[in-house]
């Protein structure tokens, strides 16, 4: 739930985190986001 989120100029502020992109193939222009596991 993002009920605690507040938006200003369309950007999330507060406690929503922004994961760092993963580039598993090194020199290739690909990124693999690590999606949270489903519990």
């Amino acid at each position: 739930s993002y009920s605690m989120e507040h938006f200003r100029w369309g950007k999330p502020v507060g406690k929503k985190r922004r994961p760092v992109k993963v580039y598993p193939n090194g020199a290739e222009d690909e990124s693999a986001e690590a999606f949270p596991l489903e519990f």
Partner: antibody
Framework: QSVEESGGRLVTPGTPLTLTCTVS????????MIWVRQAPGKGLESIGI?????DTYYASWAKGRFTISQTSTTVDLKIISPTTEDTATYFC???????WGQGTLVTVSS | DVVMTQTPASVEAAVGGTVTIKCQAS??????LAWYQQKTGQPPKLLIY???TLASGVPSRFKGSGSGTEFTLTISDLECADAATYYC??????????????FGGGTEVVVK
């Protein structure tokens, strides 16, 4: 694709220093970049991140001590007022990946 | 900030043996966890991301597991080349109130 850090040198405490990470083979507008440092014989320490859209975030201990900025081909790390505790090898890293530079050594000593 | 606590600081095992390294996050990071290997004088090498996915070219002797706050790296069939320092890294990312990109203190693996 590669990154290369430069600008490390011997400085006296309190003398601002800017380190530069030059990237080749990719555009910074698409990628997240992290600055990491490693004091001699110690572990890795994350300083801060600049996201693909230019947003920057810093570790709590690094706020007010460092600033990160970027151009189209470089990411700069400014050490605002170095202390002897900032003596370390500084790395820039493309997100979570094997794209690390060899690092640049900063020595802070009077 | 997310704080990563890694244990043990050092571990010794024989060639062909197995070592287990644990990493604990101060808050849940889901599976946003990477493992790196660093040898003296070299930058770190990515081994595992998403807690359990092997990076390109990494042998299957390396296994990552865990989610939430508890993570484990297991190295089996140890080789001399595995002697290095291993680091866990959270990359859950950052918010205006907390920095989420942190490393564990490292574990030195000595192979006898």
């Amino acid at each position: 694709q590669s990154v290369e850090e430069s600008g490390g040198r011997l400085v006296t405490p309190g003398t601002p220093l800017t380190l530069t990470c030059t990237v080749s083979g990719f555009s910074l507008s698409k990628y997240d970049m992290i600055w990491v440092r490693q004091a001699p014989g110690k572990g890795l320490e994350s300083i801060g991140i600049i996201y693909d859209d230019g947003d920057t975030y810093y570790a709590s201990w690094a706020k007010g001590r460092f600033t990160i900025s970027q151009t189209s081909t470089t990411v700069d790390l400014k050490i605002i007022s170095p202390t002897t505790e900032d003596t370390a090898t500084y790395f820039c890293v493309k997100g979570v990946s094997n794209i690390w530079g060899q690092g640049t050594l900063v020595t802070v000593s009077s | 900030d997310v704080v990563m606590t890694q244990t043990p600081a050092s571990v010794e095992a024989a060639v062909g043996g197995t070592v287990t390294i644990k990493c604990q996050a101060s808050q849940s990071i889901s599976n946003y966890l990477a493992w790196y290997q660093q040898k003296t004088g070299q930058p770190p090498k990515l081994l595992i991301y998403s807690a359990s996915t092997l990076a390109s070219g990494v042998p299957s002797r390396f296994k990552g597991s865990g989610s939430g706050t508890e993570f484990t790296l297991t190295i089996s069939d140890l080789e001399c080349a595995d002697a290095a320092t291993y680091y866990c890294q959270s990359y859950e990312g950052s918010s205006s109130s907390s920095y989420g990109v942190g490393f564990g203190g490292g574990t030195e693996v000595v192979v006898k």
